[in-house]
């Protein structure tokens, strides 16, 4: 870890506080050991150099120790997610020490001032950890810093300044403004802990990105591409409010990272898996559902430690609420065309039928365009566990659902008015489950009838385990 930029005094001088707060003799950073799940309980305030509170409050030197670090705030009161996270940690790790890092006086500022305060808060945490290290049995290996938004970068500074290396830092949608593209010593980065895992839920390539877009950890997970989170759209958020603003959407998407992490703690039996991929578009095409060579991982608390030479970007889809887990499928469809299709893009839907349940009708998202006489790959996901897949219904939507499609159809007709009808042939569909890594092949129910046209459907039944590839070995990954 690089050394701190200056002596402690210099760091204290950096504090950006209103005049009224500067005269305070009380510390601007407080460490509250949450000794009980009861929110009414005052907990214990830890004070550097004072061992008595540690003993009085039953600080467990050999147990895991979590430091929860909030971010910038527009309020003098903790946001509600904090209680949920503390409670979830207590539920999952009963013997653990859960410490809330309260830096509200320094975070409840102009954003730029709060950013400038992150370094000194990180330094305060590092000093607390250095002091705890002097105690018998306390190990930095057992320390897990969890930082939300600006708090993620505070965790980075803490990991940077501490003597030694903390076990883990989880960045929950680390803040973007003033950190995007910054030097590694001025933001959360992989060398701040033995394992740095990051969830990105509010990244935008246009306008202001509240969350950082660049990968900053050993693994960087981008649920739903890291941008638009289900259940956070204007309609979802404003539709249920008497008064609503875009702020609610921002809060919903930015804070989703916290709720995904909470979900990983409380719904251990429903873990969500993310898959390594170079970019969001390739993931949306269904290309990246491999678990070979550590290419998939659980998200949140259950993430397995991976220290790659370079950042690993991982993607997954989620539900709109807890439990967030979905089941991912890669679908490979070889499309034959015996007739000139023109420019029209088919709108395909699939329904999956399994031993446990049947899916809803799912759209096949066409990321670029359907390649004719070629194999097209799609990503579909279901909210329920279907069990073993038995059959698939493929539908080509008839009536146009958008002006854009209508225009394309009209243009296609004008260019080929005598085209007797649009028709595609599909003989089989190959499916791979992301969660089980199982591969299956589905063949057209009627081998004599493999053609599909608008308003029509085709049925496919499972015809073999695995894919029609010679000598292919497909190790099934046992995931919990």
């Amino acid at each position: 870890s690089p050394t701190p930029f200056g002596p402690e005094g210099q760091l204290e001088d950096e504090l950006h506080k209103p005049k009224a707060i500067q005269t305070e003799v009380k510390p601007s950073v407080r460490f509250n050991l949450r000794t009980s799940k009861d929110p009414e309980h005052e907990g214990c305030y830890l004070s550097l150099g004072h061992s008595q509170p540690l003993e009085d409050c039953g600080f467990n030197m050999t147990a895991k120790t979590f430091f929860i670090i909030h971010g910038w705030t527009m309020s003098g009161i903790f946001e509600n997610w904090l209680h949920k996270l503390v409670s979830a940690l207590h539920t999952r790790e009963k013997d653990a020490n859960v410490v809330v890092v309260d830096w509200l006086p320094l975070a409840h500022q102009l954003y730029t001032d709060a950013v400038n305060n992150t370094r000194v808060v990180g330094h305060s945490i590092a000093r607390m950890l250095d002091w705890l290290q002097e105690k018998d049995d306390f190990s930095l290996e057992n320390v897990h810093l969890i930082g939300y938004s600006l708090g993620a970068h505070v965790a980075g500074y803490a990991g940077n300044f501490v003597k030694g290396t903390v076990g883990r830092i989880t960045g929950l949608d680390p803040a973007g403004p003033m950190f995007e593209g910054a030097d590694i010593h001025k933001r959360l980065s992989p060398d701040d802990a033995d394992f740095v895992d990051v969830l990105h839920t509010y990244t935008r390539s246009f306008g202001l990105s509240i969350g950082i877009q660049m990968p900053v950890g050993h693994i960087d997970i981008y649920p739903n591409g890291g941008d638009f989170q289900p259940g956070c759209g204007l309609n979802d958020v404003l539709g249920s409010m008497a008064y609503g603003t875009i702020t609610e959407v921002v809060k919903c998407e930015h804070e989703r990272a916290v709720h995904l992490f909470v979900d990983s703690l409380v719904n251990q039996d429903k873990p969500s898996f993310a898959f390594q991929c170079t970019d969001s578009n390739r993931f949306k095409k269904g290309i990246c559902l491999s678990c070979r060579k550590n290419r998939c991982n659980s998200i949140g608390y259950n993430a397995k430690k991976m220290r790659n030479k370079r950042n690993s970007k991982m993607y997954l889809k989620t539900r709109a609420g807890m439990p967030f887990r979905v089941y991912h499928y890669q679908m490979k469809i070889h499309v034959f065309s015996y007739k000139n299709m023109g420019e029209i893009e088919p709108t395909f839907y699939v329904t999956l039928y399994g031993t446990n349940a049947d899916s809803q009708t799912l759209p096949l998202e066409i990321v670029e365009r359907i390649e004719q006489n070629a194999t097209n790959t799609f990503l579909v996901y279901t909210e329920e566990d279907l069990g073993d897949l038995l059959k698939i219904q493929l539908t080509w939507e008839g009536a146009s659902q958008s002006w854009y499609n209508l225009w394309k159809e009209l243009r296609s007709y004008l260019s080929q008015p005598h085209n007797p009808g649009r028709e595609l042939n599909i003989r089989r569909i190959r499916v791979k489950s992301g969660e089980t890594q199982r591969k299956l092949t589905f063949c057209a129910e009627d081998p004599e009838n493999t053609s599909i046209s608008p308003g029509r459907e085709l049925w496919f039944r499972k015809c073999r385990d695995g894919w029609r590839m010679k000598n292919e070995t497909s190790p099934t990954v046992e995931l919990p």
Epitope: P39, S75, G76, P105, M241, M322
Partner: antibody, heavy 119, light 107 residues
Framework: EVQLQQSGPELLKPGASVKISCKAS????????MHWVKQSHGKSLEWIGG????????TYNEKFKDKATLTVDKSSSTAYMELRSLTSEDSAVYYC????????????WGQGTTLTVSS | DIVLTQSLATLSVTPGDSVSLSCRAS??????LHWYQQKSHESPRLLIK???QSISGIPSRFSGSGSGTDFTLSINSVETEDFGMYFC?????????FGGGTKLEIK
Amino acid sequence: EVQLQQSGPELLKPGASVKISCKASGYTFTDYTMHWVKQSHGKSLEWIGGINPYYGGTTYNEKFKDKATLTVDKSSSTAYMELRSLTSEDSAVYYCAKGDYYGGSYNYWGQGTTLTVSS
Amino acid sequence: DIVLTQSLATLSVTPGDSVSLSCRASQDISNSLHWYQQKSHESPRLLIKYASQSISGIPSRFSGSGSGTDFTLSINSVETEDFGMYFCQQSNSWPYTFGGGTKLEIK
């Protein structure tokens, strides 16, 4: 024993201002947020806002942003709410309530201060 | 703002009966819901916090359940001292809001 003692009833004319007090005892005043709630006659409760006594940080219900100002005096463990430009709509019982550590639920309430605005 | 709806304005019960009071949120509020009892000319009193957590000093006949948007306060064998107004409150997002209340009265 935790206690929140509020100031007495007020009868004021429209346009006036009033400062209601809430003196806390039985706990560390700076460790918990203090909230203010309005209850109009025979009606439900409305959250006005909350203050963090540790450093004076506040959060307001947008509806009361121009009406109420929350402050604290740490030396006397007292929270204050000032209401300005009073109208008959402000006639109500006002409660202070101690938040839990996260500020979410209110286990202790003051006895209420009745404010009557009448010309 | 999150709207909390207590569909029953008044509930008439006989002492000894068991009763359930409902509170519905206009959006998912997880478990961030609290229940209060208020008797005439008194301050509200916290009965249940965070949907189901009991409060010391509150009789065990009061219990809470629910998560997301639908919540219930149950009173097992109502006693005469239980009559009064019951309010729910959410702390999921600002501004914190209260339900319109349900009046529990003697039949």
